[in-house]
Each structure stands twice: as structure tokens, then as C-alpha cells.
Interface confidence: low
């Protein structure tokens, strides 16, 4: 006869490991007992259990409560056992020794491999600001046994670098994603994808990118200077910019205080019926935590009684 087993048994941390050992004997042969031992322990073999044809299963104190027989029906020639709740310390080499009658003793070895699925973590890099060079957007670390694979899934253009630290029974893999921040990246997802044989499916952690920026400011409302005449109602100037974080707006008049009756409503400056006192240089100041921008315009309110048109200047500064 001969023993049938597996070269390698692979289980995920916390699962039950079936250690197979089946004696395929000739007709009339019987199995008297099957002894299981761990044989890669520091000081010789460590007994797990004894499976006796007459007295049943006896588990050594070191494995009390962790070694069982597979559920019935059982073949009397099957010496397989279950190792409950595999921990990483169980990883190693095991031996079954089968005593048969009348053929004598047989032994076989297998290796138990315990997969430790990773628990990945994603750490965002420093705050991203437009104008920076190549900057760390995020790093993703996963530790497991064997070493996990860490990749990135994103539409954003960038570069990745990985490093791995091997430990006694596991390996930690860290992958970093670097990019050159631009405003178009705002709100884009950056997903760390961790693959591992102990995972049923890839683990994904998504980080939403935030890039601080502030666009140039410009003022709208003076496109048709002929509309800016004495008595006109509903005249307004609107300051245009965009940014992340969203900017705040402030209006001032360069050549004096804002005239009475002029309403400031965020990015909009609303005028009462126009008079010549509304002529002047108006400044829109746009700011967020990242930067600030100014745009100034000169308003000349036309007097229809006068024949000559006045010039309107737009000047933008930052």
C-alpha cells in the first residue's frame, strides 16, 4: 500500500486546515493508528494527535481543542485531521505516520501554508497645490503573507514607486503615487488596489484628490460701455474666478469708498441708478487659503448730454 497526502495545504488565517493522510492499502489491510506531528519545530517533533482505530482521537495538550477528525462518514483507512482556526504560527511542516497491519509503518510529510490577508491602509500625502512639482498624492500599505500586490487604479497621470519589507512570517508592501498637481485633478478618484491569494476579491480604498488653486480674476459687465450712462438702472459688475477651496470675493474702490447705494453681493457689485459719482476704479479681490487675485476696472458713467464717448479700461492684476 501507499500513503496519499498533499505536498502543500493552503488555508487563510482563521480557517480550518484539513491535513490529508489516506492509506491506500491492499485488500484485507488495516490501519492500527495514525500519529500526526509537527516536524519543523525548534526542538524535534511536536505531537499533535494520535488517531487510534480502537480508542479514537487523542489530542496532545499543545493542540487541545484545535485538532478534530473530519465529520462522518469516515473511512477506516483515512487518517486525515482538521486543524481548527489556523494561525500563522501553525505554518510549517507536518508528518503523518501510519501503522498498518500487516504491511507495517508508512510516513508522509506536507507543508501547511497559512495565508494572512492584508488589511490595507491608505494615507494621503501633503496638501496638493497647483504649481507644485512632483508631489506625493497618497501611499498605500498592505501587510500579509505572502507579500500582497499593491497597485493603483486612476485616470490621473502620475508615477508609482513600491517598496517591500520582509518580516519573519509576512511582508509589508508600500506603494506611493506621485503626481504633478493640476486643477483638473480635483475630485478625481485615486484607488489603491490590493491583491492577495487570501482575498476572495481585490480590496480597494479610494481617495478623492483635492488640489488647491485659484484662477485669474476678471470682471464682467463693462462689455458694452455705452450702457453705462446716467440714469441706467440694474447696472452690475461680476467678478469671475474659480478655486479650490472655493474663493471669497471682496469689492473696493481704489479712488475712494464705495458710493452709497452700491450693493456688494459676493462676486457681484450692484449699482443704483447711475450717476457720475459712480465713475471710478473698482477692484475685485478674490482669495482662498491657497492664494489671492485682484482684477480692477475703470467705470466711466456717460452723460448723454456730452457728445464725446469716454474710454473704458480693463486692467487685470494678480
Amino acid at each position: 500500500g501507499e500513503l496519499e497526502t498533499s505536498d502543500v495545504v493552503t488555508v487563510v488565517l482563521g480557517q480550518d486546515a484539513k491535513l490529508p493522510c489516506f492509506y491506500r492499502g491492499d485488500s484485507g489491510e488495516q490501519v492500527g493508528q495514525v500519529a500526526w506531528a509537527r516536524v519543523d519545530a525548534g526542538e524535534g517533533a511536536q505531537e499533535l494527535a494520535l488517531l487510534h482505530s480502537k480508542y479514537g482521537l487523542h489530542v496532545s495538550p499543545a493542540y487541545e481543542g484545535r485538532v478534530e477528525q473530519p465529520p462522518p462518514p469516515r473511512n477506516p483507512l483515512d487518517g486525515s485531521v482538521l486543524l481548527r482556526n489556523a494561525v500563522q504560527a501553525d505554518e510549517g511542516e507536518y508528518e503523518c505516520r501510519v501503522s498498518t497491519f500487516p504491511a507495517g509503518s508508512f510516513q508522509a510529510r506536507l507543508r501547511l501554508r497559512v495565508l494572512v490577508p492584508p488589511l490595507p491602509s491608505l494615507n494621503p500625502g501633503p496638501a496638493l497645490e497647483e504649481g507644485q512639482g512632483l508631489t506625493l498624492a497618497a501611499s498605500c500599505t498592505a501587510e500579509g503573507s505572502p507579500a500582497p500586490s499593491v497597485t493603483w487604479d486612476t485616470e490621473v497621470k502620475g508615477t508609482t514607486s513600491s517598496r517591500s519589507f520582509k518580516h519573519s512570517r509576512s511582508a509589508a508592501v508600500t506603494s506611493e503615487f506621485h503626481l504633478v498637481p493640476s486643477r483638473s485633478m480635483n475630485g478625481q478618484p485615486l484607488t489603491c488596489v490590493v491583491s492577495h491569494p487570501g482575498l476572495l476579491q481585490d480590496q480597494r480604498i479610494t481617495h478623492i484628490l483635492h488640489v488647491s488653486f485659484l484662477a485669474e480674476a476678471s470682471v464682467r459687465g463693462l462689455e458694452d460701455q455705452n450702457l453705462w450712462h446716467i440714469g441706467r438702472e440694474g447696472a452690475m459688475l461680476k467678478c469671475l474666478s474659480e478655486g479650490q477651496p472655493p474663493p471669497s470675493y471682496n469689492w473696493t474702490r481704489l479712488d475712494g469708498p464705495l458710493p452709497s447705494g452700491v450693493r456688494v453681493d459676493g462676486d457681484t457689485l450692484g449699482f443704483p441708478p447711475l450717476t457720475t459719482e459712480h465713475s471710478g476704479i473698482y477692484v475685485c479681490h478674490v482669495s482662498n487659503e491657497f492664494s489671492s487675485r485682484d482684477s480692477q476696472v475703470t467705470v466711466d458713467v456717460l452723460d448723454p448730454q456730452e457728445d464725446s464717448g469716454k474710454q473704458v479700461d480693463l486692467v487685470s492684476a494678480s
Epitope: G42, E64, G65, V87, Q88, A89, F165, K166, H167, S168, R169
Partner: antibody, heavy 117, light 108 residues
Framework: QVQLKESGPGLVKPSQSLSLTCTVT?????????WHWIRHFPGNMLEWMGY???????YYNPSLKSRISITHDTSKNHFFLRLNSVTTEDTATYYC??????????WGQGTTLTVSS | DIQLTQSPAILSVSPGERVSFSCRAS??????IHWYQHRTNGSPRLLIK???ESISGIPSRFSGSGSGTDFTLSINSVESEDIADYYC??????????FGGGTKLEIK
């Protein structure tokens, strides 16, 4: 048979640096396991200080991180502890040990360190 | 950080009695707890790993139990040679570790 043995000065003055050596026999420190330093204070408290792995990676107790360094000499099968800026509160018995996250299975006999001027 | 609290600080028992040491973790650590015996003028000795797993060469009177946050080391029939300090240690926070404050065993 795995054996570990600590050696060091016994007495160190405050603000100086402490250097201890752990000599390992019966097992190569580059084969497997982590190689730890643990100390026992007079008040009967054990404190894990840090370790160097078989591959040379080090991890330290966050409370000591700014002062501690663990290195090894693989040719001699030694590993070392250096603790900077010692105070009287570092007076303790220092142990080296072998282990990982299933416990510390082999320990040295310990070396007593007194910090005093 | 995971803190381990051992109680009581001192246990006093008569030879032959059963004694239990308690260790409580500040958060769920599964079974990632190990127990050590530290005799005066000796080195700590690993008694139990992963809460209940026996260690080769350790007398069978030592046993461990528990999971989650509450753990117990028991000696089912105390002998005079068991006079020592007993410490629990967690490895859930690998690659860093912490010990409990210890319990001193005295013989009446």
C-alpha cells in the same frame, strides 16, 4: 540549543549613552525570528523596547523612538542596543530575547544597569 | 495603544490550591496574548502563547483561556517553585508589543 547572553557596562552616568551587546549561540540571527530588547524596572514592570528582524528591519517602542537604536553584526551573530541621553529612570535589568508575534521563547540571563552620577 | 491591566497586584495562596491570574486588554485583541513567569534572579519564561496554547517543557498545571479582552492564566495546583511574577503580553499591535503590569504570586 539556542542561548542568548547580554553584556554591558553595569554603570552609566546620566546624559551618557548606554550600549549593550547580545551574543546569540545555537541559532543564526539572519535565519528567522526577531531579536528583541526588553527591560525590567525595579518596580517590577516589563517594557518592550524594540527589535531587529532577521532581515535587519528595526521597530521601536514609540516612547523610546528618539533615543533608541538597535543594530546587528551578522558575522559575529551579535545584536546591540544603544540608548542615548540616559537618566536614572533607565535603571533596570536589560534582557535580550528571541521571538515574534507568537511570544518571546528564548531570553538572555539579563544584565543590570544602574544610571548614577 | 493597547493597554493591558493585570489584577490583582499580589496573589497569596497555599500550596496545592488553584490560582488564576487576570489580564484585561483595553480593546479586542482576539487571542493575541502570551503569558510569562518571572522568578526572582531569573529570566522571564514563556508559559502560554495565543491565550491557551501550551509551550513544550512547561508543566501541565499551567493553562490559559480567554479571548477578546479578558484573559486568564491558571495554575491548577500551586507548588512552591511557582513563586514568581506573572506577566501577560499582547502581540495584536505587531510590530510593537506591550506587557501588563504583572501579578506577584506569594505562598502562604
Amino acid at each position: 540549543q539556542v542561548q542568548l547572553k547580554e553584556s554591558g557596562p553595569g554603570l552609566v552616568k546620566p546624559s551618557q549613552s548606554l550600549s549593550l551587546t547580545c551574543t546569540v549561540t545555537g541559532y543564526s540571527i539572519t535565519s528567522d525570528y526577531d531579536w528583541h530588547w526588553i527591560r525590567h524596572f525595579p518596580g517590577n514592570m516589563l517594557e518592550w523596547m524594540g527589535y531587529i528582524s532577521f532581515s535587519g528591519r528595526t521597530y521601536y517602542n514609540p516612547s523610546l523612538k528618539s533615543r533608541i537604536s538597535i543594530t546587528h553584526d551578522t558575522s559575529k551573530n551579535h545584536f546591540f542596543l544603544r540608548l542615548n541621553s540616559v537618566t536614572t529612570e533607565d535603571t533596570a535589568t536589560y534582557y535580550c530575547a528571541r521571538g515574534n508575534y507568537d511570544g518571546f521563547d528564548y531570553w538572555g540571563q539579563g544584565t543590570t544597569l544602574t544610571v548614577s552620577s | 495603544d493597547i493597554q493591558l491591566t493585570q489584577s490583582p497586584a499580589i496573589l497569596s495562596v497555599s500550596p496545592g490550591e488553584r490560582v488564576s491570574f487576570s489580564c484585561r486588554a483595553s480593546q479586542n485583541i482576539g487571542t493575541s496574548i502570551h503569558w510569562y513567569q518571572h522568578r526572582t534572579n531569573g529570566s522571564p519564561r514563556l508559559l502560554i502563547k495565543f491565550a491557551s496554547e501550551s509551550i513544550s517543557g512547561i508543566p501541565s498545571r499551567f493553562s490559559g483561556s480567554g479571548s477578546g479582552t479578558d484573559f486568564t492564566l491558571s495554575i491548577n495546583s500551586v507548588e512552591s517553585e511557582d513563586i514568581a511574577d506573572y506577566y501577560c503580553q499582547q502581540s495584536k499591535s505587531w510590530p510593537t508589543y506591550t506587557f501588563g503590569g504583572g501579578t506577584k504570586l506569594e505562598i502562604k
